[in-house]
């Protein structure tokens, strides 16, 4: 039975040209995290494998940085980065947990940043 829950930063906004940290946290389960995928719609941004570490998709290599923790930092944001982002936790023995974050990239310099979630 899957008992875990994913906490995310929820809906966040950031300024064009700036950067943002996408964070998810899996709690309420003792399942072992084997891999975390970060995806934007159907595009793979990055993967953190428990054994082998981070792989950043070549198309995002210059704009994505791993961390902090299992989170992901998006840099040099453009309006086209607006949309849904998913953290997909692959765990054993539970299976897969998915969290959703909506990012809005604003042209304005008064972008309201959502609270940045930190892994304890």
């Amino acid at each position: 039975m899957m008992t875990g829950t994913i906490e995310t930063t929820g809906n966040i906004s950031a300024e064009k040209g700036g950067s943002i940290i996408l964070q998810c946290h899996l709690s309420s389960t003792t399942a072992q995290v084997t891999q975390v995928n970060w995806e934007q719609q159907d595009q793979l941004l990055a993967i953190c494998n428990a054994d082998l570490g981070w792989h950043i998709s070549p198309s995002f290599k210059d704009r994505v940085a791993p961390g902090p923790g299992l989170g992901l930092t998006l840099q040099s944001l453009t309006v086209n980065d607006t949309g849904e982002y998913f953290c997909i936790y692959h765990t054993y023995p539970d299976g897969t947990y998915t969290g959703r974050i909506f990012l809005e990239v604003l042209e304005s310099s008064v972008a309201e940043h959502g609270a940045r979630f930190q892994i304890p």
Partner: antibody
Amino acid sequence: EVQLVESGGGLVQPGGSLRLSCAASGFTFTDYYMDWVRQAPGKGLEWVGRTRNKVNSYYTEYAASVKGRFTISRDDSKNSLYLQMNSLKTEDTAVYYCARGQYYYGSDRRGYYYMDVWGQGTTVTVSS
Amino acid sequence: EIVLTQSPGTLSLSPGERATLSCRASQSVSSSYLAWYQQKPGQAPRLLIYGASSRATGIPDRFSGSGSGTDFTLTISRLEPEDFAVYYCQQAVPSPLTFGGGTKVEIK
């Protein structure tokens, strides 16, 4: 041409130290994981350890048989990989290979890891 | 750590024959992290197969790989004189990376 060339092997006494080098050319060194693999005379292949790439902060990991005695490092500005071997034992006698580790994910989200480029090897003999 | 057991230890065959090499893991491994290498005397290993079944660049199609879970197979459909060598399987996840003990394919 993608190439790896090891050097630094030789004869050393038990308890001694040796530093192996691996010069890489023909590819973007900083993007790749790099592994050391050894082969004792007449035996099979044994993984020694690896250093991850820049994205992974050059994290290093080692086989249990060498942990605490061997240290892997790299200098991306020189496209070079190193293996510092201390407290050498007779059972460390082997040909040492450096190899390029390919770590990536396909469009199917399947992960891959394999060693696609190997050096010619350098011989380390530990004997009194 | 995962132990990879290769069998047979030695395979004696004639050119033109089919070679079937086995690699068995002590526990389940992801097929995408399973590779096969060929090594000839005095030479470095050469990558043949990765992801259990994908041929590396420049590898002839007489080499094929298959399997999943704990059982993997390397098949050489028709042995050529240059195929007589030692073959190793390797897995990378879970850590640490391990190799099988090798199978020597020799001329009968």
